[in-house]
Every structure is written in C-alpha cells, then in structure tokens.
C-alpha cells in the first residue's frame, strides 16, 4: 500500500481467483484513543472499533472511503483504491490502446517546436467518476523539472455504438534548451482513477521524436506566363522554432484532386516556393518536416488551383526569438568552410537515417539505457552550439562537434560494427563512417589539434547485443548529426565570409 495523495491510498493486488489479498492497517488521524468506530462509504454499519482498523482487501467491495468517528463526529477519512495486477501485468482498463505507432500505446505526445512545450493526449470510453493527474520530468534517476497543467476533456467522438472521450494535457520543460542534443528522455506519468480503480500509464520520449510542425502558412499561387505551371510559395508556421536558418524545415508540395487515388504532381523542396502543374478542380497542398531529423510531417495546408489567392496554413503564436542579422567572423580561430560542412553534414543526416531507417520507430529504451547513451558525447546546453553561442564564438561548438565526429567515426570502425553480424564496407554504415571522417577533417585543418574523447569499452560479446548496441549508437548519431547540420546550415547562412 502506498499514499497517492493526502488520505488517498493505493492497494496493489495480485488479481486471480481465491487470491489472499492484502492485509491493510488503517490508523485514525486523531489524538483520541478510545470510543472510535469505523464505517465504509455511506454505510452506517460499524466495521470495528479502536484507533486502528485491520482489514483484508481482496476485491473492489473492500475498497472505498473508510471513516473513523467518535460520538457522531467524523475524525478522519482514508480512501482506498485498488491497483490490479493480473499475470504480472498491471491493468490498463481505463484508457484505450491507440495502437499507433505500436500496440500498447495509451499516451501520445506531440511538440510543435523545440521549445520544450508538448501536448499529450489519451482516449477512454468512460464518461463519469474519472480523474487524471499528470507528472513529468526529464530523466528518471536525477529528474529535471517539467511542469504540466491539468488534464482536460478536449474532444468527444462517436465510434459505432460507443462514445469516445479524448483528454489532453500541456507540459513545459522548466529549463528547455532548444538547440541542445537531448541525452535524457522526457518521462510522462499519468495517474488515472475510475471509481475505486487506480491505474498508471507512462510514456518516455525525446522531444525530437515527437516533433510535428504546424502546417506552412500563407500559401500563395502565381501562374507562370505561357505555361501550365504555377509558382506556389508559403512561409514557415509561426509556432516553429527560430531562427529558421538554424531550425530548418523541408517541404512536400502536392497537387491532387479531391479523391485520394487521383493522379498528382509532387515535389520535395528545402525552399519556401516550388513550381508545380495545377489542374482544374485540384488543390495545391504543402506540408513540412524537420529538415535534419525524420520526425512527423505536419498536416497539409491547402489552396485550390482555381483561385490564385492565399491560405493561412499555420496557427498559433510564435516560436522563440527572431534573428536574421549577419554574424561577425569567428573570434579565436579560423573559420571553417561553412558551406562544405553544411553539405557534408546534411549528407550525414541522410546516411544516418538510411543506415537504419526503422530505428526512429523502434523503442530501444530499456533498463539501464540512460547509462548506455551517456557513454556517447552529446552537444549540450553549454557547448555554444545555439545561434547565440555561434555568434559569440563558434570555436567552442566546432570543437565539440569535432570531438563527437571522431568519437562516432571510431565507434563505427570498432568491433561493434565490424564484428558479427557483418556489414559490407560500402553499406550505408560504411559510407557514414567515411563521411564522418571527411567532415572531421574539414573541421580540423592540418596543424590544428583539439583533444578527443576516449572511446568507452562498450564492446558486447553476443551478436544480438552487438546488433542492439548498433541500433542505439545509430539512434544517438542521428540526433548528433541533426544538431551538427543545424549548426553548419546556420553558419553557412550567417557566418560565411
């Protein structure tokens, strides 16, 4: 038994036929010693007397509000809730499995940007006697603060004969660092109470994995002279992180009729305009995705082909800070070839995802995982890799990126990747290895020496362990190169001579 909140206790029960249940001792919160009686809920039947009451809790009939009285006066209450465990698994009766992106997904979370603000939601078919409370933190062993509001009913839907209720909550990391590479996941814990049943649900994620930008805004069409082509332009959504030279998006532009199976024109671009072929009765739609990390696409923003008007795709209020001014040259060191670094780091992003595309959708976090991923270098908050830090002195950040590149280059050349099951030399991992080396050489010219980090002894003995470790390394490499690519894109746009 444990205390959920003041005067509310959760009894954990193994739930099977003829289970013995749990013996619970309740103590009346009073200085009085005698003449105390106990009742349950609205019943006037006296269950026992004395300052303590011992009960055997086996089923929901044994749960409820226990009250101690003296001479018709209420002294204190203790509410007992039950948390059922069947075959070693805690019950999940209150919330509905959303089955996306995988089975047993009860909580789903999304973030519109890297500000540390995110929204989680869940579904239930229960309409009454239902309460939720939400807690969150960054990391679990040494948790950093995340503040969550109250869960509210956000939507009601009819699904066949049933009504389905969607609840949501907004949370904000207390000390968010949008430009840093996350090393510890956000943990979200939802306590759900229905009548006398208690359940808890958890989700663990990195903000980068739950990013879903708002749709592009202000779609505009401009027909091209003597052509079937139309130039479509748009803007970044207001809610996306700034500056956009650092937090860049990529876009998919599509022209399609009302029916899903109709023919279409489709083009991908990193720019905020594209030329497409418009057809009568068709619409032009644009959606956005983080340019360097394969998280979710936004919803579509659309405008009909017939009108050459504009559409407000995005909504909501702005990201964090602006900044398009030119930055001064790098103090305290020679400037890298920003544009070359940008191209190579973007190639690294592509390779990191093609080396293991599914890794983004696999849940590789398990016990002890915080330790495993902390063995690799991360671009942290104080490393100067944010736009302001790059403006002040990019050398700190470049040194950190260089250390990481060397580290991962050595890891990809180690027994973890060269051992069984074997990879061929020109596999995406082989190309990734070569590109890491190429970028590190671009960053550190001859005669320039930065200290490098020691490689920890991660080498596992079993092939399956090696495979799991590869996944984890590639996973964190994807995050590392995304930050590096943002740094070089921003540098190329604002720091290049």
């Amino acid at each position: 038994i444990w205390e959920l909140k003041k005067d509310v206790y959760v009894v954990e029960l193994d739930w099977y036929p003829d289970a013995p249940g749990e013996m619970v001792v309740l103590t009346c919160d009073t200085p009085e010693e005698d003449g105390i009686t106990w009742t349950l809920d609205q019943s006037s039947e006296v269950l026992g007397s004395g300052k303590t009451l011992t009960i055997q809790v086996k089923e929901f009939g044994d749960a409820g509000q226990y009250t101690c009285h003296k001479g018709g006066e209420v002294l204190s209450h203790s509410l007992l809730l039950l948390h059922k465990k069947e075959d070693g698994i805690w019950s999940t009766d209150i919330l509905k499995d959303q089955k996306e992106p995988k089975n047993k997904t009860f909580l789903r979370c999304e973030a519109k940007n890297y500000s540390g603000r995110f929204t989680c939601w869940w579904l239930t078919t229960i309409s009454t006697d239902l309460t939720f409370s939400v807690k969150s933190s960054r990391g679990s062993s040494d948790p950093q603060g995340v503040t969550c509001g109250a869960a509210t009913l956000s939507a009601e839907r009819v699904r066949g004969d049933n009504k389905e209720y969607e609840y949501s909550v907004e949370c904000q990391e207390d000390s968010a660092c949008p430009a840093a590479e996350e090393s510890l996941p956000i943990e979200v814990m939802v306590d759900a109470v229905h009548k006398l049943k208690y359940e808890n649900y958890t989700s663990s994620f990195f903000i980068r994995d739950i990013i879903k930008p708002d749709p592009p805004k202000n779609l505009q069409l401009k027909p091209l002279k003597n052509s079937r082509q139309v130039e479509v332009s748009w803007e970044y959504p207001d809610t996306w992180s700034t500056p956009h030279s650092y937090f860049s998006l990529t876009f998919c532009v599509q022209v399609q009729g009302k029916a899903k199976r109709e023919k279409k024109d489709r083009v991908f671009t990193d720019k905020t305009s594209a030329t497409v072929i418009c057809r009568k009765n068709a619409s032009i739609s644009v959606r956005a995705q983080d340019r360097y990390y394969s998280s979710s696409w936004s919803e579509w923003a659309s405008v009909p082909c017939s009108g050459s008007g504009s559409s407000r795709g995005g909504s909501g209020s702005g990201g964090s800070g602006g900044g398009g001014s030119k930055l001064r040259a790098v103090p305290g060191g020679s400037s890298p070839a920003w544009t070359q670094c940008q191209q190579l780091s973007q190639k690294l992003c592509t390779l990191a995802w093609s080396a293991h595309p599914l890794v983004g959708h696999m849940d590789l976090r398990e016990e002890g995982d915080e330790e495993t991923t902390n063995d690799v270098p991360h671009i942290q908050c104080g490393d100067g890799c944010d736009p302001q830090g790059l403006r002040d002195n990019s050398q700190f950040c470049l040194q950190r990126i260089h250390q990481g590149l060397i580290f991962y280059e050595k890891l990809l050349g180690s027994d973890i990747f060269t051992g069984e099951p074997s990879l061929l030399p020109d596999s995406p991992v082989g190309q990734l290895h070569a590109s890491l080396l190429g970028l590190s050489q671009l960053l550190q010219p001859e005669g320039h020496h930065w200290e490098t980090q020691q490689i920890p002894s991660l080498s596992p003995s079993q092939p399956w362990q090696r495979l799991l470790l590869r996944f984890k390394i590639l996973r964190s490499l994807q995050a590392f190169v995304a930050v590096a690519a943002r740094v070089f894109a921003h540098g190329a746009a604002t720091l290049s001579p």
Epitope: D265, V267, F268, S354
Partner: antibody, heavy 118, light 107 residues
Framework: QVQLVQSGAEVKKPGASVKVSCKAS????????LHWVRQAPGQGLEWMGW????????EYAPKFQGRVTMTTDTSTSTAYMELRSLRSDDTAVYYC???????????WGQGTMVTVSS | EIVMTQSPATLSVSPGERATLSCRAS??????LHWYQQKPGQAPRLLIY???QSISGIPARFSGSGSGTEFTLTISSLQSEDFAVYYC?????????FGGGTKVEIK
C-alpha cells in the same frame, strides 16, 4: 494490369513527320499522365513531354517545343506523339509511359523504333 | 536545365557482390530523384522513387539514398538478372532529365 502497347517500327525520310501511337488498357485512361521518352541507339534516355488525357494539357521539353505534338483519344484510350521535321539524329526508340504521379515513369510501353534515313 | 551525372560509366562486379552506383545533380534537387533499370532490348523499369522509396515487386536488395546533389543506388548482392544499365532521373523541375547511365557488367 496497366499495359501500354505501341505502334510498330517506322522508317522516315529527313524533313518528314512521324506519328507514334500508344494504346492503354487495364485502367481508366484519364486517371494517369502520359509521357513520351526517347532513346537514341546506344544512348541514354531523353524526356520529350507529357499530356494529361483528362483535359489535353501538355508540357514539352524546350528542345522539342514547336516540333512535337502530343494528343489523346479518350474514346479509344490511345495517346499519340507526332514529331515533325525529322532529322537523322531523331533516330531512336520512342517510349510512352503512364503514371498517376506526374514526374516519374512507372509503366512503360514496349517502345517504337523510328529510323530517319535518306 | 538540371544536368545529371552518373558514375562510373561502367561497373564490373562479380555475382553476389555489392554494387554502389552514384548520381550527381548540377544543383540541389532535395529528394526528387528516381532510379530505373534497363536490360538490352527492353523498356526501362522503375526501381526506386524519391531517392529511397521502394517499389512493390522490386527485390529488397535494391536500395537508394541521398538528398541535395548526391545520390546512391545500392544493390546489396548482385544476382545474374541485375546486370543491366541503371539510370537516375530528376523531377525537381521541368524539363525532366536523366543521367547518362551506369552499365553494371559481370566481372
């Protein structure tokens, strides 16, 4: 399944015109874009243009503008490509292809060899 | 127009080996890049679209990667039926253009 059957080989004199046909089956003719791509002997592929059978819209590669005309006959599910003022370097296999997506080529015809020789 | 350059022009590989074909665009084309295979006397067939998307019915040994200006088609373990000419094609802007092709021949 989606199928494109092209007309037979042609031999033409320089300055003449050629009209190659492409009969579609296995799908609703107006649901796919139709492209024409050619390949000179031992050479690579060269895109000529596309037509939307639904409305007759066309887009031609600048190289062929003014010399090529693409048309369709929806009653027979047939597309046509006419190339005028033929030169010897127009000797090639001409392919029609169809796709629901405008910018790449999914289903190909078997090709029609057009020889331009005096 | 966008110029597509493929390398090498000819690639000699033994059956069972891996083949890596390159395609470079004269300007950034995002992921608007498609790969085709052509055998002698046959029409080309689509292998990969939008740089890395696989086509149903195409063996899993064919994979694509890249974005921007540099792209790669990888055949993980060459089978006898894979010896052919491979073309890349950009769809970033009209006119649509192809690379000159890479001939994969038996070593």
């Amino acid at each position: 399944q989606v199928q494109l059957v092209q007309s037979g080989a042609e031999v033409k004199k320089p300055g003449a015109s050629v009209k190659v046909s492409c009969k579609a089956s296995g799908y609703t003719f107006t649901d796919y874009y139709l492209h024409w791509v050619r390949q000179a002997p031992g050479q690579g592929l060269e895109w000529m243009g596309w037509i939307d059978p639904e409305n007759g819209d066309t887009e031609y590669a600048p190289k062929f503008q003014g010399r090529v005309t693409m048309t369709t006959d929806t009653s027979t599910s047939t597309a046509y490509m006419e190339l005028r003022s033929l030169r010897s370097d127009d000797t090639a296999v001409y392919y029609c292809n169809a796709n629901k997506e405008l910018r790449y080529f999914d289903v190909w015809g078997q090709g029609t060899m057009v020889t331009v020789s005096s | 127009e966008i110029v597509m350059t493929q390398s090498p022009a000819t690639l000699s590989v033994s059956p069972g080996e891996r083949a890596t074909l390159s395609c470079r665009a004269s300007q950034s084309i995002s992921i608007n890049l498609h790969w085709y295979q052509q055998k002698p006397g046959q029409a080309p067939r689509l292998l990969i679209y939008f740089a890395s998307q696989s086509i149903s019915g195409i063996p899993a040994r064919f994979s694509g990667s890249g974005s921007g200006t540099e792209f790669t088609l990888t055949i993980s373990s060459l089978q006898s039926e894979d010896f052919a000419v491979y073309y890349c094609q950009q769809s970033n802007s009209f006119p649509l253009t192809f690379g000159g092709g890479t001939k994969v021949e038996i070593k």
